[in-house]
Amino acid sequence: SGTTNTVAAYNLTWKSTNFKTILEWEPKPVNQVYTVQISTKSGDWKSKCFYTTDTECDLTDEIVKDVKQTYLARVFSYPAGNVESTGSAGEPLYENSPEFTPYLETNLGQPTIQSFEQVGTKVNVTVEDERTLVRRNNTFLSLRDVFGKDLIYTLYYWKSSSSGKKTAKTNTNEFLIDVDKGENYCFSVQAVIPSRTVNRKSTDSPVECMGQEKGEFREI
């Protein structure tokens, strides 16, 4: 069979949620392999995912070193088999990714309601503080640790018997809301970073309702 040309990667796309960050690209390789390099604007190009036939590369370990830095990646196409390199002077083809700033761009993962507790006409709703892969002093930081007050949560709540929703906001992971005595309520939360221009909001958490296992009801 004849030789084919090495082709450059295209559609380089960052997929990132709560800082778990994967670079994806096309095409599926035929007689070629890929190596990815990542760099900050001022840093060295570091090779990762050597000679791979995958079309994705997990770059989490690199970006969590400083989530506020801006990163650039590039994907090299290397001939592997019955192919000819189309790079000039023996240089392999490569394609650059868009720039990526994790702190500003990572998607906020779907939050989870950890618990709710009713005391009389008050309900305390707690949002799980999800662990990220960002490390400090050898421990993993939570989403709140990383974003601090930049991160707020919006609570949507409504009586089980009606569809009218109310909202509350907090810059902690807890809400304290007023409810009508003797009524069951349902809750859903959403993570929000108001200062962002893109990827401002997470998807809504699964709905949790009073009278189910997750909550605790105490009549005072």
């Epitope: 392999v33 190596t35 840093g43 060295d44 190009w45 570091k46 090779s47 050597f50 000679y51 791979t52 036939t53 070193k65 090299f76 290397y78 001939p79 592997a80 088999g81 019955n82 192919v83 023996g90 392999p92």
Partner: antibody, heavy 117, light 106 residues
Framework: EVQLVQSGAEVKKPGESLKISCKGS????????MNWVRQMPGKGLEWMGM????????RLNQKFKDKATLSVDKSISTAYLQWSSLKASDTAMYYC??????????WGQGTTVTVSS | EIVLTQSPATLSLSPGERATLSCSAS?????MNWYQQKPGQAPRIWIY???NLASGIPARFSGSGSGTDFTLTISSLEPEDFAVYYC?????????FGGGTKVEIK
């Protein structure tokens, strides 16, 4: 011109420690992974592992995990391979080699390590 | 780890003859290199990416293969070709070398 210059031959006794070096020049030392390869007398090549000088990340062949340690000193563009307690079976030629694609191929001249009582 | 088995261990041939060196992998490999090593010297890249000749390597050398079976072929041996040849896979960590094939003068 890219060059990797390794330290000279070593003769050691079992149980002694040793650190051999590989000095890079003619390129950005921190930008390239550095491989270490072992060749026991009359035998083939074995990939021991590699280190990225900019942040000292290592990828180590598990076979050598408890035997040898890779390190770097960026300030003098030097990579190191060290042992805390040598054995006779560590007797070998050790090569450093810059991780490169394709025709780019830069190896040190090798360091002979002899461990004998 | 991927084990690479080279055969034969020794190939005794005369100048002008064709040499076929095999490298068999214990599981599928997508990126294979070949190195040449002469006594007292460091190895030197010979073929990379299965079939690409390194800079300055004469066209009498060729590489081929896929999956688990790879071949280095020398169409007509020259005196300077007598050496040991190693295959190396870089598809998965740890990267591994074959045991080598010594091409010696008959």
């Amino acid at each position: 011109e890219v060059q990797l210059v390794q330290s000279g031959a070593e003769v050691k006794k079992p149980g002694e420690s040793l650190k051999i070096s590989c000095k890079g020049s003619g390129y950005s030392f921190t930008s390239y992974w550095m491989n270490w390869v072992r060749q026991m007398p009359g035998k083939g090549l074995e990939w021991m592992g590699m280190i990225y000088p900019a942040d000292s990340e290592t990828r180590l062949n598990q076979k050598f995990k408890d035997k040898a340690t890779l390190s770097v000193d960026k300030s003098i563009s030097t990579a190191y391979l060290q042992w805390s307690s040598l054995k006779a079976s560590d007797t070998a030629m050790y090569y450093c080699a810059r991780e490169d694609y394709g025709s780019s191929d830069y190896w040190g001249q090798g360091t002979t390590v002899t461990v004998s009582s | 780890e991927i084990v690479l088995t080279q055969s034969p261990a020794t190939l005794s041939l005369s100048p002008g003859e064709r040499a076929t060196l095999s490298c068999s992998a214990s599981s599928s490999v997508s990126y294979m290199n070949w190195y040449q090593q002469k006594p007292g010297q460091a190895p030197r890249i010979w073929i990379y990416g299965i079939s690409n000749l390194a800079s300055g390597i004469p066209a009498r050398f060729s590489g081929s293969g896929s999956g688990t079976d790879f071949t280095l072929t020398i169409s007509s041996l020259e005196p300077e070709d007598f050496a040991v040849y190693y295959c190396q896979q870089k598809s998965s960590f740890p990267w591994t070398f074959g045991g080598g094939t010594k091409v010696e003068i008959k």
